[in-house]
Interface confidence: low
Amino acid sequence: MKTLPAMLGTGKLFWVFFLIPYLDIWNIHGKESCDVQLYIKRQSEHSILAGDPFELECPVKYCANRPHVTWCKLNGTTCVKLEDRQTSWKEEKNISFFILHFEPVLPNDNGSYRCSANFQSNLIESHSTTLYVTDVKSASERPSKDEMASRPWLLYRLLPLGGLPLLITTCFCLFCCLRRHQGKQNELSDTAGREINLVDAHLKSEQTEASTRQNSQVLLSETGIYDNDPDLCFRMQEGSEVYSNPCLEENKPGIVYASLNHSVIGPNSRLARNVKEAPTEYASICVRS
């Protein structure tokens, strides 16, 4: 009967293993859940420069098997999967990071992103995180806060294209004007071309409504006011779907550019469609001796 103690030992061992799940011995972190968790903060944002490399991190907590994680970019109410983008995992002591690589950051990377994890047939979605991309090339010519809501950004985009003919026309008109001026000293030209006048305008803060995010340079996202980016002064009023622009101060002079009467709002337009343009003004050039 020497087998009896051995059998008893095996029996005890069996009960220990049987009770382990109930005793929570496996759980190293105490009472922490073994569910997959995505630790992207609500209202998180990153202000980054175009041209720089950047790693967008999705902190993932899991226990045994690493879940399948993907990144997507918010486009209105849908989140478009970023399957062709370079991603990687970075393992830290108590948390892992699923990283979306930007090599480098492009201006159109501006927008809200979300990571999601597939775990045991469950889909877990993170909060969205917002990238605010500053285009370094246009940084020197970026408008002030006061101009932000009123400048027709389309004009900005069209200037490189339309600027040359405009310049030639202006020069031609000036040339004609000067010739007339030389020929008739006392005669003044009434209309010397349609030069855009930069006027002092008193801009008023206007409330705008939006229920979907715009993937434009001005991103209406679920985040709070971004005090540190001069270009981003829209905030979502808490508990509502109304966006307002608190950054415009009344009676502050700003530059208003004349409209080119283009009604096309393309994907490159930096102005959210619902932001009203300021009235435009024109002026004639009068050359005096």
Partner: antibody, heavy 119, light 108 residues
Framework: QVQLQESGPGLVKPSETLSLTCTVH????????WSWIRQPPGKGLEWIGY???????KYNPSLKSRVSISVDTSKNQFSLKLTSVTAADTAVYYC?????????????WGQGTTVTVSS | EIVLTQSPGTLSLSPGERATLSCRAS???????LAWYQQKPGQAPRLLIY???SRATGIPDRFSGSGSGTDFTLTISRLEPEDFAVYYC?????????FGQGTKVEIK
């Protein structure tokens, strides 16, 4: 164990710029938010602003026009600059690490450095 | 800006007694974004509670946090001599962090 050490001049003249540096010892500056908080003598805590290791910043609106926070990941340091100081800026300045995932608690603090604004 | 109002300003109690500290927000705060800190004279604040009710590493279980929305509470079940200090609540609102003005727990 992560420790934070504030350094900088203890006395600053009015209208000058206050500059402080926080060095992170025993851990990486990566993956965390790094905040500056101050406490005027006998008063409560006031959050100044934070910087994420990537360089993203957010500031207290009441100080925004005067404050800037920068990070140097190679030196494991982040810095605070406060311009045009007055006597009201006299305080103990703390740097703190903020756990960046899900919760917003400041789990590690420096011991604080006293800055007096006086001529 | 979310304003946090702590009450009472000062709490005079004896060791072994129960302390109940209140923190009221001017508008709703997510429970995930409320923390409590303890500060002793000449020292930096120390994290006690995060996410309104989770104890930080190394914090004794006599400290507990509760509440949601605009009303949050820090409870010290049995005051120890080392618990006499100033306690601050802190939140992360829509745009930045704010602290309450503090509650001083002093020996009666």
């Amino acid at each position: 164990q992560v420790q934070l050490q504030e350094s900088g001049p203890g006395l600053v003249k009015p209208s000058e710029t206050l500059s402080l540096t926080c060095t992170v010892h025993g851990g990486s500056i990566n993956h965390y938010y790094w905040s500056w908080i101050r406490q005027p003598p006998g008063k409560g805590l006031e959050w100044i602003g934070y910087i994420y290791y990537s360089g993203s910043t957010k500031y207290n609106p009441s100080l925004k026009s005067r404050v800037s926070i920068s990070v140097d990941t190679s030196k494991n340091q982040f810095s605070l600059k406060l311009t045009s100081v007055t006597a009201a800026d006299t305080a103990v300045y703390y740097c703190a690490r903020e756990w960046p995932y899900y919760y917003y608690e400041m789990d590690v603090w420096g011991q604080g450095t006293t800055v007096t604004v006086s001529s | 800006e979310i304003v946090l109002t702590q009450s009472p300003g000062t709490l005079s109690l004896s060791p072994g007694e129960r302390a109940t500290l209140s923190c009221r927000a001017s508008q709703s705060v997510s429970s995930s974004y409320l923390a409590w800190y303890q500060q002793k004279p000449g020292q930096a604040p120390r994290l006690l509670i995060y996410g309104a009710s989770s104890r930080a590493t190394g914090i004794p279980d006599r400290f507990s946090g509760s509440g949601s929305g605009t009303d949050f509470t820090l409870t010290i079940s049995r005051l120890e001599p080392e618990d006499f200090a100033v306690y601050y609540c802190q939140q992360y609102g829509s745009s930045f962090r704010t602290f309450g003005q503090g509650t001083k727990v002093e020996i009666k």
